[in-house]
């Protein structure tokens, strides 16, 4: 009988303790927000906000410019000065709550916790391949704003998410802010609003549309806005909030809110509950039917998917899918199953479910006792009636009022619990060739790059490495610049290639040559590496 090589166990064919050093930038303080810009003429930039400062970096993460955004009331505050001679409000540090690009101008918009949550607009000025910020414009007109009606009060100190959409000759800011009674009383930023940036950059147009948590619920009902994005005809917000206005406020769940990206109105505001579960292949005795619920969204990202995952999700390749990392509760502490699970929600399916929910509410025969919901935003009512009314009047449409869809969208963990003890804190999904890759940051400062695929009982790693020695959590927001992703951890920004940091963690030639084509791995004497690392022979075809 022929002698055969002993088979190397899969886990032994790789070493996740291999050190990779990726380019980084030390921001000088905890990174609060980060966004990237890629112009159509090869110019690009990374914008990094820390308390009281905004850094502009080149694509090589070298500093190009730095701007003082606080403290408010300090003569050195460069953004504050754009609002003219002060004082404009109580002195205090500026924590950046919003950092977004307005692609139509193009410009960077930053909004902070100070000065009533006002924003500043910085036109982008390309210089070669770098980008500079022009002098900021103060998006605040004092005579237009009052504590009870403040179009220019955008950011909440409790957190704000913004997505900018170009419509016509203006940029519309889709804004979602967490509120409590104190924040609502002082220049209330509203819960959800759509604000039109004025052409003269003096602020936002008055008379904007908005929804806000009703005063009686502000103390007990808090909404955390986790993520926002624009795709197709809609803007979406993802929230974590109490499952009920009346029950235990600590019983949380996740919702998707959908707003029209083509009409700056809130009549077609819709919410849908997202249900993510861990359903082990072999169910333990006493485990809940349908799997263990993971009701709290931690991070999310939407992306078009590659062919293989598309087939598994029964959708077409390239269709947009919302990916979310869910945990069992706010603390994300250990439960029976894994710490983190990942669920995939195809956008077209989400839209279909929402549209079906509208039909159920508005098309006769309406199921008796079907509630319009959203009682924290509007007066309770039953379908098809408008909020607070007993019946529809002839000139109103059931469809022109906000609605919570009566069914939820349920999915199970794509990774079948294989993330185990890992606590995922950041997520970005890319399509490489026909492969869909989840790039995840973790609570202990690591990056995991894993193929998103359902049908396996092990994880297909592109990489799993530590960003540095600090072990600080990777922050929620990830940005892409060219073929790199930017992750923030502590006071550092790290630049990670989307195709992985290298190949040295593959220990055997067989494993090396089975790596994905996009990684560019080959066998190099006695190690796995990319061609640029190999001065001698580099082999992608066969093992010695």
């Amino acid at each position: 009988e022929d002698w055969q090589c002993p088979r190397t166990p899969y886990a032994a064919s790789r070493d996740f303790d291999v050190k990779y050093v990726v380019p980084s930038f030390s921001a000088g303080g905890l990174v609060q927000a980060m966004v990237t810009y890629e112009g159509d003429r090869n110019e690009s930039a990374v914008f990094v906000a820390i308390r009281n400062r905004l850094h502009v970096l080149g694509p090589d993460l070298k500093s190009v410019q730095s701007l003082a955004t606080g403290p408010a009331g300090d003569p050195g505050c460069q953004t504050c000065a754009a609002c003219g001679p002060g004082p404009h409000g109580p002195p205090g540090d500026t924590d950046t709550k919003v950092l977004v690009l307005d692609p139509a101008l193009p410009a960077l918009v930053s909004c902070g916790s100070s000065l009533q949550g006002r924003c500043f607009l910085h036109d982008l000025e390309p210089q070669g391949t770098a980008v500079h910020l022009a002098a900021p414009a103060c998006l605040f007109s004092a005579h237009h704003n009052r504590p009870d009606d403040c179009p220019d009060c955008v950011a909440s100190p409790l957190g704000t998410r913004v997505t900018v959409v170009e419509q016509g000759q203006a940029s519309y800011f889709y804004v979602a802010s967490s509120l409590d009674a104190a924040v609502a009383a002082s220049f209330s930023p509203r819960s959800v609003s759509i604000r039109r940036l004025k052409a003269d950059a003096s602020g936002f147009a008055p008379g904007f549309v908005a929804l806000s948590v009703l005063p009686k619920h502000l103390v007990s009902y808090s909404i955390e806005y986790v993520h926002s994005f624009h795709t197709g005809a809609f803007v979406y917000f993802l929230t974590v909030q109490p499952a009920s206005v009346t029950d235990d406020p600590s019983a949380l769940h996740t919702r998707l809110a959908r707003l029209s990206a083509t009409e700056p109105e809130l009549g077609d505001y819709r919410e849908l509950v997202l249900d993510c579960r861990f359903a082990p292949k072999r169910r333990r005795r006493g485990a809940p039917e349908g799997g263990q619920p993971y009701p709290v969204l931690r991070v999310a990202h939407s992306a078009p998917v590659g062919a293989q995952l598309a087939t598994e999700l029964s959708i077409a390749e390239g269709q947009e899918v919302l990916f979310g990392v869910f945990v069992t509760g706010k603390d994300g502490g250990p439960g029976v199953g894994p710490n983190s699970v990942v669920c995939a929600f195809p956008i077209d399916l989400l839209d279909t479910l929402i549209d079906e929910g509208v039909e159920r509410c508005c098309e006769s025969p309406v199921h008796p006792g079907l509630r319009r919901g959203l009682d924290f935003f509007q007066s309770p009512s039953f379908c098809p009636n408008p909020p607070g009314l007993e019946a529809l009047s002839p000139n109103t449409s059931c469809r022109h009022f906000p609605l919570l869809v009566s069914s939820s969208f349920s999915r199970v963990d794509l990774f079948n619990g294989l993330l185990g003890p890992v606590q995922v804190t950041a997520l970005y999904v890319t399509r490489l060739d026909n492969v869909t890759v989840a790039h995840m940051g973790t609570m202990d400062g690591r990056i995991l790059q894993v193929e998103l695929v359902r049908s396996l009982n092990y994880l297909l790693y592109v990489s799993n490495f530590s960003l540095g020695d600090s072990g600080q959590p990777v922050q929620r927001d990830v940005s892409r610049l060219g073929d790199h992703l930017l992750f923030a951890s502590g006071d550092q920004v790290f630049q990670v290639p989307i195709q992985g940091p290298g190949c040295r963690h593959f220990l055997t030639c067989g494993r090396c040559l089975r790596a994905w084509h996009f990684m560019g791995c080959g066998w190099c004497g006695n190690m796995c590496g990319q061609q640029k690392e190999c001065p001698g022979s580099w082999q992608q075809d066969h093992c010695p």
């Epitope: 170009e166 419509q167 016509g168 052409a199 197709g232 029209s260 083509t262």
Partner: antibody
Framework: QIQLQQSGPELVKPGTSVKISCKAS????????MNWVRQKPGQGLEWIGR????????RYNEKFRDKAILTVDTSSSTAYMQLSSLTSEDTAVYFC??????????????WGQGTSVTVSS | DIQMTQSPASQSASLGESVTITCLAS??????LAWYQQKPGKSPQLLIY???SLADGVPSRFSASGSGTKFSFKIDSLQSEDFVSYYC?????????FGGGTKLEIK
């Protein structure tokens, strides 16, 4: 009534530049965007870009970014478009047009009569 | 860029008849659509804004419908002055783009 009066026809040589004007009357120039549109002989309409006279902020169609420069002189209520490095491909009628809000929506509601630019050696 | 596909490129009709022109957007634009009329040697004139709303002074025989990606424009009871060119335009995202135009001719 509101009018946009454009400068007269131009016959120019290849490689040169031309600056055409559009004078607004009976409304405040700085309150509305001014757009420029090209129409080649026997063809359709192409949007070149727009300028907001209140701030001089411009937005160009990428196709025309290296061709057109939009400016305004608010003291004379006049908008200008300079076309550079002219070739026979730039032979066209150029229109200025105001865009305005109608409720939430926008439309180009007043147009100049057009300026014919012919590029020929 | 958003492509606007207008059809037909030309159409023959008789006085008093109705005609319909369609415009398809390559992506959803809500109701950010305008229709213009252009007479030979003249500048375009606004007829319809917000996909369905008639501009001031435009006769009621002109009408339009649609939202999202599919739009149509109708002229009832054609009169001699209507036999000119018509363009749709999306104003949702820059660059604002026009359809290729439709030339109406008398049969």
């Amino acid at each position: 009534q509101i009018q946009l009066q454009q400068s007269g026809p131009e016959l120019v040589k290849p490689g040169t530049s031309v600056k055409i004007s559009c004078k607004a009357s009976d409304y405040t120039l700085t309150d509305f965007y001014m757009n420029w549109v090209r129409q080649k002989p026997g063809q359709g309409l192409e949007w070149i870009g727009r300028i907001y006279p209140g701030t001089d902020k411009t937005r160009y169609n990428e196709k025309f970014r290296d061709k057109a420069i939009l400016t305004v002189d608010t003291s004379s209520s006049t908008a200008y478009m300079q076309l550079s490095s002219l070739t026979s491909e730039d032979t066209a009628v150029y229109f200025c047009a105001r865009s305005a809000y109608y409720g939430n929506y926008v439309a180009m509601d007043y147009w100049g009569q057009g300026t014919s630019v012919t590029v020929s050696s | 860029d958003i492509q606007m596909t207008q059809s037909p490129a030309s159409q023959s009709a008789s006085l008093g008849e109705s005609v319909t022109i369609t415009c398809l957007a390559s992506q959803t634009i809500g109701t950010w659509l305008a229709w213009y009329q252009q007479k030979p040697g003249k500048s375009p004139q606004l007829l319809i804004y917000a996909a369905t709303s008639l501009a001031d002074g435009v006769p009621s025989r002109f009408s339009a419908s649609g939202s999202g990606t599919k739009f149509s424009f109708k002229i009832d009871s054609l009169q001699s002055e209507d036999f000119v060119s018509y363009y749709c335009q999306q104003l949702y995202n820059t660059p604002w783009t026009f359809g290729g135009g439709t030339k109406l001719e008398i049969k």
